[in-house]
């Protein structure tokens, strides 16, 4: 008996071939011997089966001795043994129809779980293997679960159902709703304008929700809400903003915030959350601000950084075009009695300068100039 696998919602064509290459009488029946369709001369006739409106054949092939049964919009319950009667012969074809669906919406928040459920006919024992867009393979039976979805899981999942050494492939498009970056860090000199950007990693027709930026300043004992906003069809409107600092927010996507001045008291970490309409849970992006200040007080030239820096980073003070006078894994370094000239304060990671502030040291009888 020939086995054919079909996909729910698809069309399948079951073949039946006569030895004579001409149009002769044929019938397709199901396992209950109920006629599905056949011919009378050159006319297609249909029986009383439940496939009536979904069953068809290809009349153009009859003259070649081919009498296919076409079933459209397949249902799981169409799984059956179909019998083609032609030339006093019976050809049996077992059709097994499978369906694979995502447990919920195919638009899921980062960190949520994806469950794929296989619908299969009674008596079948299929195995399923799915390959994610990033090449991760997962195997299972009737259900497959992937916990903690990541941004790289966005895209087409290809799932193969195996039964009786036959395969049928399903493709499911999954959209993971997330920010492009889980975390970002902005390095600024004191007094510079700060731009925070929160690009989304997905595009949808209409985007509605609400968001908030909570900020934990390094110098503060607790975090506070800096801004709350609404999102309606990709248009941003500010609901509430603190007076210090007075953030500005762009009216269009991507979400964009401007801090007029980088100051040591603002250095720290923020968490932007975005709650989307009709979705449980929130999107998160962490943002960090590191602020540098170079100062000269009397005979002491000091360079300081505030904010979430790593112990990998070196803070250095150097006279322009010379090797560093001091270079330490600290957040503050200083030089006593610095010689006159343009001094550079550098925050660097393995030699890559992340932040630089210049200060001009004048001969001892005059005051310093901050460029």
């Amino acid at each position: 008996k020939k086995v054919v696998l079909g996909k729910k919602g698809d069309t399948v064509e079951l073949t039946c071939t006569a030895s004579q290459k001409k149009s002769i009488q044929f019938h397709w029946k199901n396992s209950n011997q109920i006629k599905i369709l056949g011919n009378q001369g050159s006319f297609l006739t249909k029986g009383p089966s439940k496939l009536n409106d979904r069953a068809d054949s290809r009349r153009s092939l009859w003259d070649q001795g081919n009498f296919p049964l076409i079933i459209k919009n397949l249902k799981i319950e169409d799984s059956d043994t179909y019998i083609c009667e032609v030339e006093d012969q019976k050809e049996e074809v077992q059709l097994l129809v499978f369906g694979l669906t995502a447990n919920s919406d195919t638009h899921l928040l980062q960190g949520q779980s994806l469950t794929l459920t296989l619908e299969s006919p009674p008596g079948s024992s299929p195995s399923v293997q799915c390959r994610s867009p990033r090449g991760k393979n997962i195997q299972g039976g009737k259900t497959l679960s992937v916990s903690q979805l990541e941004l790289q899981d966005s895209g087409t999942w290809t799932c193969t159902v195996l039964q009786n050494q036959k395969k049928v492939e399903f493709k499911i498009d999954i959209v993971v709703l997330a920010f492009q970056k889980a975390s970002s860090i902005v390095y600024k000199k004191e007094g510079e304008q700060v731009e925070f950007s929160f690009p989304l990693a997905f595009t949808v027709e209409k985007l509605t929700g609400s968001g908030e930026l909570w900020w934990q300043a390094e110098r503060a004992s607790s975090s506070k809400s800096w801004i709350t906003f609404d999102l309606k069809n990709k248009e941003v409107s500010v609901k509430r903003v603190t007076q210090d600092p007075k953030l500005q927010m762009g009216k269009k996507l991507p979400l964009h915030l401007t801090l007029p001045q980088a100051l040591p008291q603002y250095a720290g970490s923020g968490n932007l959350t975005l709650a989307l309409e009709a979705k449980t849970g929130k999107l998160h992006q962490e943002v960090n601000l590191v602020v540098m200040r170079a100062t000269q007080l009397q005979k002491n030239l000091t360079c300081e950084v505030w904010g979430p820096t790593s112990p990998k980073l070196m803070l250095s003070l150097k006279l322009e075009n010379k090797e560093a006078k001091v270079s330490k894994r600290e957040k503050a370094v200083w030089v006593l009695n610095p010689e006159a000239g343009m001094w550079q304060c550098l925050l660097s990671d393995s030699g890559q300068v992340l932040l630089e502030s210049n200060i001009k040291v004048l001969p001892t009888w005059s005051t310093p100039v901050q460029p």
Epitope: E330, S348, S350, G351, Q352
Partner: antibody
Framework: QVQLVQSGAEVKKPGASVKVSCKAS????????INWVRQAPGQGLEWMGW????????GYAQKFQGRVTMTRDTSTSTVYMELSSLRSEDTAVYYC????????????WGQGTTVTVSS | DIVMTQSPDSLAVSLGERATINCKSS????????????LAWYQQKPGQPPKLLIY???TRQSGVPDRFSGSGSGTDFTLTISSLQAEDVAVYYC?????????FGQGTKLEIK
Amino acid sequence: QVQLVQSGAEVKKPGASVKVSCKASGDTFSDHAINWVRQAPGQGLEWMGWMNPKIGNTGYAQKFQGRVTMTRDTSTSTVYMELSSLRSEDTAVYYCVYDSSGYDAFDIWGQGTTVTVSS
Amino acid sequence: DIVMTQSPDSLAVSLGERATINCKSSQSVLSTSYNRNFLAWYQQKPGQPPKLLIYWASTRQSGVPDRFSGSGSGTDFTLTISSLQAEDVAVYYCQQYYSTPYTFGQGTKLEIK
């Protein structure tokens, strides 16, 4: 995991220059620096400087300032250390070293290149 | 520059006994900003490059036997080998990576008594 393979032994006359190469195989260089450390016969270890092979930035110990030059060829994942105006006290094994975490506690060392300065 | 001084210069210990090597820095290598000691210990056998044993003064590098341990903070550090094995015969160096130029101790030669 990065492996560092250095060029072969060199014999030089005083006043000459030597250029030692250090090729990274396995993973290519990440954003971390390659450092150079030397060891004179029967002596301890001496740090010479660093280079970030991705961007070409360098930093040298004051002692070698003006005599040492570190360069790189990104197409071959190779870093070079050139020491000029050689003197007999520069006779040493020169190591290129790397820290896979970026903190400069050196967990990966080249096999060393012996440089002999002799008239 | 930070000067690293090791003691003793050489040490002879019986197999199975404890070996202790000290390292003193001329300035603190404890970062007050990050509360970490930027100190490493290396082992060097003849004809081989040094091998990293300990970093952050007390964290063992992966693959290093647990008989090796590091302790200390600020300016005074110790490398301890709890039960000396024949393969531990080598020269041991401390290194600070807190401030450039990075500097090493002069080395301690460990032998079997």
